[in-house]
C-alpha cells in the first residue's frame, strides 16, 4: 500500500435545502484506471461511512440507488455532493480515495471538510 | 501566516448603510469561511453570521437577518459586511475571523464603526 | 440556540497563582468548544481549539478540559501578560455563540 496526497476544502457550508458539494483532489502518481471513493464522517471522535463508490477513469460515478451522495469526476478530481443534510448531521467528512487498478495500489485520506448544516426555518402557516 | 486585514473605521449617520472588507492572505480563501463578530463598547463577542467563501452560502444569526450582507471576492481573497439601516446601538467594534474546522481561529484587527446623528 | 455562560465574571489573582475558568453549554456540544484570549484594545486570539488542544504558538501553561457541557481552562502559573479577558465559543451547531467571558486581572 502506497500513500497518496488527497486534498479537499476545510469548511463548507451547506444550503438551506440540505446540499452540500465539494472537491475531492488526489495526486495520482500514475495512470489509474479503477477508483474507490469513499466518504466517512467523524463526529465526536466516531468515524462512519457516508458513502462510496467505484468508477472507470473517464466514467461517472455510481453510489447505490439509496445514498446519499452523487458525484462527478474529471481527471484526478472528483465533485461530490451529499444531500438531505440536516443539523445533526453537521460534521468532519472525510474523502477517501483508492486506487484499485493497476497495480500498486495506492490510499489517499484527506484531512476532512467540515460540513456545518443549519435546519431551515419552518414557513409559517399561511391561511387560504 | 495567516493575515486578516479590515478597512479603516467609519462613521455612519443612523439610517446610512456600513461596508467593512476584510483581505485574506496567508491561506487558500476558498477552503475557508469568514465570520463576522461584532463587540460593543465594554461588551461582549457576539457573533453575527458567516459565508463559506467555498460555495458563498451564508448563515446569519436571527436579529441580523434582512439587515446584514455577507459576500466575498475570490478574485481578490476579500470578505465584505454591509448592516443596512444602522442605529446608535450598531456601534461597536466589527471583526471578521477565518472560520475553519475548529470554529474561529485567526481574527483581523477590527473595524470601529460608529454611528451618530 | 447554545447557551454558553462561563464563571467566575471577574477574578484578581496574584502572578504564579492557578486560574480556573468554567465553561458551561445549554446543551451537549461534544468537544466542539474553543477558548480565546482578549487584551485591551486587541482582536481575540485562539488558545484552545476542541476543548484541549492547544493552538499553535500559545504557552504551555494554559491547558483545557472538558466534554459535553461542562469545560474548564486553567492558567497555571499565571503571568502579567495573562491579564485579559477569556472568551469560551461553540463551534457544535450553527449559529455559532460565545460565552459572556472572563476578566482576569493581576493583584
Known amino acids: 500500500c502506497k500513500a497518496m496526497h488527497v486534498a479537499q476544502p476545510a469548511v463548507v457550508l451547506a444550503s438551506s435545502r440540505g446540499i452540500a458539494s465539494f472537491v475531492c483532489e488526489y495526486a495520482s502518481p500514475g495512470k489509474a484506471t479503477e477508483v474507490r471513493v469513499t466518504v466517512l464522517r467523524q463526529a465526536d471522535s466516531q468515524v462512519t461511512e457516508v458513502c462510496a463508490a467505484t468508477y472507470m477513469m473517464g466514467n461517472e460515478l455510481t453510489f447505490l440507488d439509496d445514498s446519499i451522495c452523487t458525484g462527478t469526476s474529471s481527471g484526478n478530481q472528483v465533485n461530490l455532493t451529499i444531500q438531505g443534510l440536516r443539523a445533526m448531521d453537521t460534521g468532519l467528512y472525510i474523502c477517501k480515495v483508492e486506487l484499485m487498478y493497476p497495480p500498486p495500489y495506492y490510499l489517499g485520506i484527506g484531512n476532512g471538510t467540515q460540513i456545518y448544516v443549519i435546519d431551515p426555518e419552518p414557513c409559517p402557516d399561511s391561511d387560504f | 501566516q495567516v493575515q486578516l486585514v479590515q478597512s479603516g473605521p467609519e462613521v455612519k449617520k443612523p439610517g446610512a448603510s456600513v461596508k467593512v472588507s476584510c483581505k485574506a492572505s496567508?491561506?487558500?480563501?476558498?477552503?475557508?469561511?469568514i465570520g463576522w463578530v461584532r463587540q460593543a463598547p465594554g461588551q461582549g463577542l457576539e457573533w453575527m453570521g458567516w459565508?463559506?467563501?467555498?460555495?458563498?452560502?451564508?448563515n446569519y444569526v436571527q436579529k441580523f437577518q434582512g439587515r446584514v450582507t455577507m459576500t466575498t471576492d475570490t478574485s481578490t481573497n476579500t470578505a465584505y459586511m454591509e448592516l443596512r439601516s444602522p442605529r446608535s446601538d450598531d456601534t461597536a467594534v466589527y471583526y471578521c475571523?477565518?472560520?475553519?474546522?475548529?470554529?474561529?481561529?485567526?481574527w483581523g484587527q477590527g473595524t470601529l464603526v460608529t454611528v451618530s446623528s | 440556540e447554545i447557551v454558553l455562560t462561563q464563571s467566575p465574571d471577574f477574578q484578581s489573582v496574584t502572578p504564579k497563582e492557578k486560574v480556573t475558568i468554567t465553561c458551561r453549554a445549554s446543551?451537549?456540544?461534544?468537544?466542539?468548544l474553543h477558548w480565546y484570549q482578549q487584551k485591551p484594545d486587541q482582536s481575540p486570539k485562539l488558545l484552545i481549539k476542541?476543548?484541549?488542544q492547544s493552538f499553535s504558538g500559545v504557552p504551555s501553561r494554559f491547558s483545557g478540559s472538558g466534554s459535553g457541557t461542562d469545560f474548564t481552562l486553567t492558567i497555571n502559573s499565571l503571568e502579567a501578560e495573562d491579564a485579559a479577558t477569556y472568551y469560551c465559543?461553540?463551534?457544535?451547531?450553527?449559529?455559532?455563540?460565545f460565552g459572556p467571558g472572563t476578566k482576569v486581572d493581576i493583584k
Open positions: 446543551q451537549s456540544i461534544g468537544s466542539s
Open positions: 476542541y476543548a484541549s
Open positions: 496567508g491561506y487558500t480563501f476558498t477552503s475557508y469561511g
Open positions: 459565508i463559506s467563501a467555498y460555495n458563498g452560502n451564508t
Open positions: 465559543h461553540q463551534s457544535s451547531s450553527l449559529p455559532f455563540t
Open positions: 475571523a477565518r472560520v475553519g474546522s475548529s470554529g474561529v481561529d485567526y
